[in-house]
Interface confidence: medium
Amino acid sequence: QNSQLQEELRGLRETFSNFTASTEAQVKGLSTQGGNVGRKMKSLESQLEKQQKDLSEDHSSLLLHVKQFVSDLRSLSCQMAALQGNGSERTCCPVNWVEHERSCYWFSRSGKAWADADNYCRLEDAHLVVVTSWEEQKFVQHHIGPVNTWMGLHDQNGPWKWVDGTDYETGFKNWRPEQPDDWYGHGLGGGEDCAHFTDDGRWNDDVCQRPYRWVCETELDKASQEPPLL
Amino acid sequence: QNSQLQEELRGLRETFSNFTASTEAQVKGLSTQGGNVGRKMKSLESQLEKQQKDLSEDHSSLLLHVKQFVSDLRSLSCQMAALQGNGSERTCCPVNWVEHERSCYWFSRSGKAWADADNYCRLEDAHLVVVTSWEEQKFVQHHIGPVNTWMGLHDQNGPWKWVDGTDYETGFKNWRPEQPDDWYGHGLGGGEDCAHFTDDGRWNDDVCQRPYRWVCETELDKASQEPPLL
Amino acid sequence: QNSQLQEELRGLRETFSNFTASTEAQVKGLSTQGGNVGRKMKSLESQLEKQQKDLSEDHSSLLLHVKQFVSDLRSLSCQMAALQGNGSERTCCPVNWVEHERSCYWFSRSGKAWADADNYCRLEDAHLVVVTSWEEQKFVQHHIGPVNTWMGLHDQNGPWKWVDGTDYETGFKNWRPEQPDDWYGHGLGGGEDCAHFTDDGRWNDDVCQRPYRWVCETELDKASQEPPLL
C-alpha cells in the first residue's frame, strides 16, 4: 500500500508541477498583455490629449480669422452703405481709418508741430486723440509703436486741457515718472506745453514746435445705429 | 517509509499552499489591473465621444459663419460691381435691402401717408410691395412684425389695383374678415382706399393719409444673371 | 497511519483539483477580459484615427474657404478704397475682373467685331489681351474655353502688331499650323487681319468683322502697392 501511496504522491507532485508551470506561464502572459495594454492605453491617452490640443489650437486660430471677417465684413458693408446712402450720420469709419469702441482713429505717418497736427484733425471734423481709459491707451499704443506722437492734451493757456473738453483732473493719466515738468533747459524758448506719447507709450510734455506724428480721433454718431433710409 | 511519505506530503502541502497564495495574489492583481484598464478604457471612450461631439459642434458653428460669409461676400461684391459698373440690370440688392426670391425689399422704420410712401419707393426705382403668394406674405410679415404697414394696393380710382399692374381679381388675397369695407365712420372725410398689413399680417383698407410704415420692392432683372459687362 | 495518509492525500488532491479548476477559470476569465480590452483598444485606436482624419479634412476644407475669404476681403477692401480714394494708381482689379501676375483680365460673354472690342477695352482704360508667355496663354485659354476670342494682335496696317506696342517679332507666338494665312476665300472682301484664339487655344487670323468674344487686359501699376494716404 505504501508503494501505491508513493505512486499517487509522485503523480500529484507531477500534476502540481505541470500546473504550476502552466499557471505561471499564463499569469506571466496575462501580466505582459496587461502591461502592453496599459502602455498602449497611456499612448492612446496622450495621443488623444495631443489631438485635442492641436485641434483646439487650429480651431481657435480659425475662429480668430472668422471673428476678424465678421468685423471686416461689417465695416465693408457699412462703408458700402455710406457710399450708396445719404444718411448725414456716419455709422462707420472712412476707409483707412481704424474703428475702435465707437470711435474712428487716423494715424499719421509724417510729423508736424502740435498746432499743425491739431489744425489737421479739426479740418477733418475730428480732433487730436483724447485718451480716456487704460484700454484706449493700449489700443493707441499698439498702433503707433515706439514713436513720439502728439495727443490732444496741452497747457498752453495755463492748466492742462483735453481738446474736446474732457475733464483733465478727474480723467485717465499716464505720465512718465516726474512728468510733466515744463522743462526750460531745451534752449528753444519757453517751457513744454504739449503732451505726447513716448517710445514706451507713457506721456511726456514737450516743446509744441517739435515735428511729431499725431493721431486724429472722431466719434461715430451716437444718434442712430439704424441703417440710413436708402 | 511512512515518515518519509509524511515528510513529502507536508512539503507538497506547503509548496501547494505557497503557490496557491502567490497565484491568488497574482490573479487578484491582474484582475484589479484589468478592472482599472477597463474603467480607464470606458473613460477614454466617453472622453473621445465628448471630444468628437464638442469639435463637431464647434465645426458646425464655424461652418455656419463661413457659409454666411460666402453669401455676404457675394452680395458685397455684387453691390460693389453695381457701384462700379454701368450695367443697366441690377443683379443684386442694394445694401440694407433684403433679397428674397429674386426680389429686393426695403422695410421702413418711420411712417408716411400712402402717397408719400408710394413716391418714396418710386424714387428708389421700386414700388410699394405687391404680395403675390402666401409664401411672400409670410416673408413680409416676418420682417414687419405686428405693425400697420402700407402695401402697393389701393382703390383710389375705383377697382382695387396693385401698383405694378399685377391682376387683383385672380391674384393672392389675405383680407381680414369683413374687409375691405370702405368705412366712412372715421370722420376724416371719404372712405378707405389704401390697403395695409395689420398687426396679425392680414389686410385692411384704411384712410390713405394715415402715417403707416411701408415696404418697397424691386425685382432683380430676369434678363441676365451674369455679372454686368464692366 | 496509512489510512490517515491516504485521507490527507485525497484531501490534498481535492483541494488541488478545486484550486486548478478555479485558477483555470480565473485565468481564462482574465484572458477573455484582456482580449476584449485589446479589441476595444484596437477599435478605439482606429476610431481615434478616423476622427483625426475626418476632423483634419473638415478643418482643411474650412481653411481653404477662410484663405479664400482673406483674399476676397482684401480685394473688396482694395476696390472700396479705389472707389473712395483718388489714388491715380490702381492697386487691385475691379470687381468681376480676374487678377493674374499683376494684370487684370476681363472676359466678355457676348461678341463684337475686333474694332468694337478694341474700343470697349480702351474705354475701360485697358487693351485687348497681349499674350507674352506660354504661362499667360494657358491662363487665358483656361478662362475662355473652346471659343473663338479676339486678342490684341492685328496686321491691319501691314506688319503684325500688338496693341500695347509689345514687339511681335521677338515675342511669344502660338499660331495654328499654316497660320496666319491672310485667306481671301471667305468672300467677305479683303483678307484676314485680326488674330483670335481658336477652340484649342492656338491662334488664327480672321476677318476683323466677325462677332467674336474678347478679353481686356490692364496692368496693375508697379509704382505703389501701398494703400493711398487718405
Epitope: 476707409v95 499719421s108 509724417s110 508736424k112 498746432a115 489744425n119 489737421y120 471734423d125 | - | 480714394g85 494716404l229
Partner: antibody, heavy 121, light 108 residues
Framework: DVQLQESGPGLVKPSQSLSLTCTVT?????????WNWIRQFPGNKLEWMGY???????RYNPSLKSRISITRDTSKNQFFLQLNSVTTEDTATYYC??????????????WGQGTSVTVSS | DIQMTQSPASLSVFVGEIVTITCRAS??????LAWYQQKQGKSPQLLVY???NLADGVPSRFTGSGSGTQFSLKINSLQSEDFGNYYC??????????FGGGTKLEIK
C-alpha cells in the same frame, strides 16, 4: 477720374436767391473729403464761401453766414449752393472744388470749370 | 480773419528767367498754405500744398518754401506755359480760408 461740373442760371435778379449745383463724377461725396464753393469776382479776387463735408457737416465764410446754405443730394452725387438776397456785388464766376487731405496738409485738388453768374435787374 | 498779402501784384519777365512770388500771412499759419496757378478762362490748378509739397504732375521747376507767416513760390527757368495768375491760400484754424490777392505773371 474725379470731375466736378457746376450748373445753374447765369442771370439772377437783385434780392432773389442764387442756386447752383455741383455734380461730381468719379468719386462719392459721402466717402471722404470736404466739398467747397469758391467764387472769383470780376477783378480776379478769389473768395472761399463754404463747404459740406463727406459726413454732411457744413462750414461757411462768416461774411456770408446769414445768406448762405450748402446742401447735398447723395443719391445724385451732387451738392448745392444757395445764396439769398443777392446784390450786384455777388456777380462772379462760381467754382466748386474738392479739398483733399494729404498727409502733410491740404489743397483744393479738383475744381469745376466754373459758371458765370451776373446779378442784374 | 487771417489776411493773406501777395506780392508783387504783377510782374513781366522773359522766358528762362527765375521768378519769386511771396505771400505773407497776418498770423502764424505754420505750413498750412497752398499755391494755385490759373490760366485765362480756366479754373485754378493746385501747384503746391503744405507750403513745400508739389502736387501731382507739377514740374520740378516750381518750388514752394517758408513757414509761419512768410512763404514764397519760386519758378526756375520760366516756360511760356507758366504765364497766368498765381494765388496763395491758407488752411489754418477756423474758416474762412482766405486767398491772397493774386500775382499776374506776364511774358515780356
Amino acid at each position: 477720374d474725379v470731375q466736378l461740373q457746376e450748373s445753374g442760371p447765369g442771370l439772377v435778379k437783385p434780392s432773389q436767391s442764387l442756386s447752383l449745383t455741383c455734380t461730381v463724377t468719379g468719386y462719392s461725396i459721402t466717402s471722404d473729403y470736404a466739398w467747397n464753393w469758391i467764387r472769383q469776382f470780376p477783378g480776379n479776387k478769389l473768395e472761399w464761401m463754404g463747404y459740406i463735408s463727406y459726413s454732411g457737416s457744413t462750414r461757411y465764410n462768416p461774411s456770408l453766414k446769414s445768406r448762405i446754405s450748402i446742401t447735398r443730394d447723395t443719391s445724385k452725387n451732387q451738392f448745392f449752393l444757395q445764396l439769398n438776397s443777392v446784390t450786384t456785388e455777388d456777380t462772379a464766376t462760381y467754382y466748386c472744388a474738392r479739398r483733399y487731405r494729404y498727409d502733410e496738409g491740404y489743397g483744393m485738388d479738383y475744381w469745376g470749370q466754373g459758371t458765370s453768374v451776373t446779378v442784374s435787374s | 480773419d487771417i489776411q493773406m498779402t501777395q506780392s508783387p501784384a504783377s510782374l513781366s519777365v522773359f522766358v528762362g528767367e527765375i521768378v519769386t512770388i511771396t505771400c505773407r500771412a497776418s498770423e502764424n499759419i505754420y505750413s498750412n498754405l497752398a499755391w494755385y496757378q490759373q490760366k485765362q478762362g480756366k479754373s485754378p490748378q493746385l501747384l503746391v500744398y503744405a507750403a513745400t509739397n508739389l502736387a501731382d504732375g507739377v514740374p520740378s521747376r516750381f518750388t514752394g518754401s517758408g513757414s509761419g507767416t512768410q512763404f514764397s513760390l519760386k519758378i526756375n527757368s520760366l516756360q511760356s506755359e507758366d504765364f497766368g495768375n498765381y494765388y496763395c491760400q491758407h488752411f489754418w484754424g477756423t474758416p474762412p480760408w482766405t486767398f491772397g490777392g493774386g500775382t499776374k505773371l506776364e511774358i515780356k
